[in-house]
């Protein structure tokens, strides 16, 4: 593929001397894979990110790139290495014909190759500005700590760094990696080029309309004057941040990614690496009124993904589209008619809408939390953001029906005090992807590396499922749900908690022979029950109900259907205490709930009995929800009786530790 500008100096033909024979053969049984954006108009064929295996050194990356050039030259193709990645992901960016992909996939060290694709600013209308003065009294909002210990990196358009709102707060780095603007008649007008980034910088740290008024920012230009960038440019930007962090370690870092493109394995992988290096990444869920899991970086589990709500806490509609939703969204934040710095003049303000603005709010809140508690890990920060959010205020009817249960009903809020939440036992609910409908399909939900999986449940809209179980995978417990024959698929639901110094294990009882049902308890000294799961091989458990739900005096026990194996999650942690709370309804009902009291945190949520008319159980904040089939299809037999079982825990150790600090 010829480059129109003929920019091929150190290209390729000189590399013919490098012999194919020098290549180490790829390991047997491992095949590199090729990925490309599912949204055709966003694809950028001709540019590819070649991702190498994790332990590949820079010298090997360079050698692999040269080998590709030599082999391509031998076939008469020109190629150009645009960038060699190191620091975050090993690999390189190459401009070449798609004809060479088969060749490239066979190179040594290659893990996968991804075709480059576009990413976009997530504000509407980000260049049709409505100049408005700030519409509030500044003294209504004067936070105790403005995030002064934190640096926020903004990957966006260029910005007007001397706007009165942000002057002296934003350091414009020399990083720029943007595609050419579309259209031959495009006129670059500075104020339009700067519009999106200036507004977001103002929302994060603006003097008068900012969330974290003390936060300092650094901007990287990865979006052009039309608000468009590339996955590769964003990757190189993230690598730049990692290298800056290594060269000059500062305090906590927050990276704001107010952009979205189609699902990208490589962009998600880079975000994961940066997050594991201690950086907090916050991103826009996307403005496509769609499942956020179909977009990147929104779909990266390590990133805090933010949807947009309006002043009435309703999901934001943006033209014919609106905020994204689904299990990949962590929480929502204000994203409609947000006042911020306008690049039209140094004192102008403008209102913009979108998930970019929502993400900027959360980046600001994160900066303030980290400034107050600089040692917070990503997991701790995410749990606090969730904990302090306004709960159950979003009208879920706006979301597609199948997404309502998966979408968190949380709107970000500043903690009442930035200190003193340390005593709380924090937990969150993590939904898996849908398993798909095949008979043996399973779905897996995972917690973050420094979270503990305290319980596991499952849910199926058809009710055809074979339960769930906790199992070890790569040294960590995961939650796996099992589909049943004729089922439309299942979800696994993990309850992920912050429990320092915890030692957790799973105790399993196989299906019981007797009619009493299956039971399992935590028999180790000092271990308490945090969750119960049940899994069965039979297609339909029938109507058997254990005569006794839980024998008195044995709170550390899980009980279940005699044909099911029962799994108890048993944990030992300093000062951890748990109790079981049940709410049974004799008549059939579509939903049964039981909540933990103030000061206690829901760690486990399950249903009794495990019969097939129960669709599943899941935790929503501190409430255990058990869903059953539509009452009209069940009839009002005793089969309809369902009990929701909550396990509520608290940590006396954490409470004492926080009292000692105060």
């Amino acid at each position: 593929q010829e480059d129109e500008d003929g920019d091929y100096e150190e290209l390729v033909l000189a590399l013919r001397s490098e012999e194919d024979g020098l290549a180490e053969a790829p390991e047997h049984g491992t095949t590199a894979t090729f990925h490309r954006c599912a949204k055709d108009p966003w694809r950028l064929p001709g540019t590819y990110v070649v991702v190498l295996k994790e332990e590949t050194h820079l010298s090997q990356s360079e050698r692999t790139a040269r080998r590709l050039q030599a082999q391509a030259a031998r076939r008469g193709y020109l190629t150009k290495i645009l960038h060699v990645f190191h620091g975050l992901l090993p690999g390189f960016l190459v401009k070449m014909s798609g004809d060479l992909l088969e060749l490239a996939l066979k190179l040594p060290h290659v893990d996968y190759i991804e075709e480059d694709s576009s990413v976009f600013a997530q504000s509407i209308p980000w260049n049709l500005e409505r100049i408005t003065p700030p519409r509030y009294r500044a003294d209504e909002y004067q936070p105790p700590d403005g995030g002064s210990l934190v640096e926020v990196y903004l990957l966006d358009t260029s910005i007007q760094s001397d706007h009165r709102e942000i002057e002296g707060r934003v350091m414009v780095t020399d990083f720029e990696n943007v595609p050419e603007e579309d259209g031959t008649r495009f006129h670059r007008q500075a104020s339009k080029c700067d519009s999106h980034g200036t507004h977001l910088a103002g929302v994060v740290s603006g003097r008068d309309a900012g969330v974290a008024k003390g936060a300092s920012m650094r901007s990287l230009r990865v979006l052009n004057c039309q608000g468009k960038g590339t996955v590769s440019g964003t990757l190189i930007g993230l690598e730049f941040i990692r290298k800056s962090q290594l060269v000059q370690p500062v305090g906590p870092l927050v990276v704001l990614l107010p952009l979205a493109g189609g699902y990208s394995r490589v962009l998600n992988a880079a975000c994961q690496r940066l997050a594991r290096a201690g950086v907090v990444l916050v991103t826009a869920a996307g403005n496509f009124r769609d499942d956020a899991c179909l977009y990147s970086p929104a779909s990266a589990p390590e990133v805090i993904t933010v949807g947009a709500t309006n002043a009435q806490d309703q999901p934001v509609t943006l033209g014919t589209l609106g905020t994204n939703f689904g299990r990949c969204v962590d929480l929502f934040a204000p994203g409609e008619d947000i006042i911020g710095a306008s690049s039209d003049c140094s004192t102008c303000f403008v209102s913009q809408s979108g998930t970019s603005q929502a993400a900027a709010h959360v980046a600001g809140i994160a900066a303030m939390m980290l400034s107050a508690e600089p040692e917070l890990t990503l997991a701790e920060l995410r749990q606090r953001l969730i904990h302090f959010s306004a709960k159950d205020v979003i009208n879920e009817a706006w979301f597609p029906e199948d997404q309502r249960v998966l979408t968190p009903n949380l709107v970000a809020a500043l903690p009442p005090s930035t200190h003193g939440a340390g005593w709380q036992l924090f937990c969150r609910t993590v939904w898996s992807a849908h398993s798909g409908p095949t008979r043996m399909a399973t779905a897996v939900a995972r917690c973050a590396p420094d979270e503990e999986l305290l319980s596991c449940s499952s849910f199926s809209r058809s009710g055809k499922r074979r339960g769930e179980r906790m199992e070890a995978q790569g040294g960590k417990l995961v939650c796996r749900a099992h589909n049943a024959f004729g089922g439309e698929g299942v979800y696994a639901i993990a309850r992920c908690c912050l429990l320092p110094q915890a030692n957790c294990s799973v105790h399993t009882a196989p299906p019981a022979e007797a009619s009493m049902g299956t039971r399992v308890h935590c028999h180790q000294q000092g271990h308490v029950l945090t969750g119960c799961s049940s899994h069965w091989e039979v297609e339909d458990l029938g109507t058997h109900k254990p005569p006794v739900l839980r024998p008195r005096g044995q709170p550390n026990q899980c009980v279940g259907h005699r044909e099911a194996s029962i799994h108890a999650s048993c944990c030992h942690a300093p000062g951890l205490e748990c109790k079981v709370k049940e709410h049974g309804i004799p008549a059939p009902q579509e939903q049964v709930t039981v909540a933990c009291e103030e000061g206690w945190t829901l760690t486990g949520c399950s249903a009794l009995p495990g019969t097939s008319h129960v669709l599943g159980a899941y935790a929503v904040d501190n409430t255990c929800v058990v869903r059953s089939r539509d009452v009209s299809t069940t009839g009002s037999t005793s089969e309809g009786a369902v009990t929701a079982v909550a396990i509520c825990c608290r940590s006396r150790h954490l409470a004492q530790a926080s009292q000692e600090l105060q």
Epitope: P133, P134, R137, A138, D139, Q142, Q160, S161, D162, R164, E167, G168, V170, M171, V172, A190, S191, R207, D208, K213, C345, S346, T347
Partner: antibody, heavy 115, light 109 residues
Amino acid sequence: QVQLVQSGAEVKKPGASVKVSCKASGYTFPSYGISWVRQAPGQGLEWMGWISAYNGNTNYAEKLQGRVTMTTDTSTSTAYMEVRSLRSDDTAVFYCARGYVMDVWGQGTTVTVSS
Amino acid sequence: QSALTQPASVSGSPGQSITISCTGTSSDVGRYNSVSWYQHHPGKAPKVMIYEVSNRPSGVSTRFSGSKSGNTASLTISGLQAEDEADYYCSSYTSSSVVFGGGTKLTVL
């Protein structure tokens, strides 16, 4: 360290123009605008306007609109402020300062308008 | 733009505390967080002592503090010292400009 260095004193006749310069050093020039402030003898400080060192946009005090022009030269990190049609009541010390916050000030340039 | 209102003069003895007020309107001091205080010794360049209502630049003594309530901002100097004698000006953003106070002459007795 961050510094703003202004040009020397000027004596002008009424109706003439004066152009004061302000050379910045010690920071990234386009990251901050430059404010201009004056102080007439026995009077307080008066804000004259601001110029963006990033894109050259200006914001002038209403009172001076039409008589003042602010410019920058990013290649030399220098800001300029010109006042035309000088009157005797324009006699003042003119200061440049960094940004709207005015956290760093030049040493001042005395402009005397006298016939 | 009419100037912010400051007392023409205040005085205090060494070691005492004094407060200088700066009254504006809901369009300037009341609306914006960007109130600054400048110390001006005759013949020298002004020096920022407080910015954004209550922030102190590095190098400025902790004896200087700022606050705001409604449309009035205040500068407090505790443990007054002879070198504090100077003119003090407040400033605030307005919707599209910056406005200064008339200045307060501080005399250390």
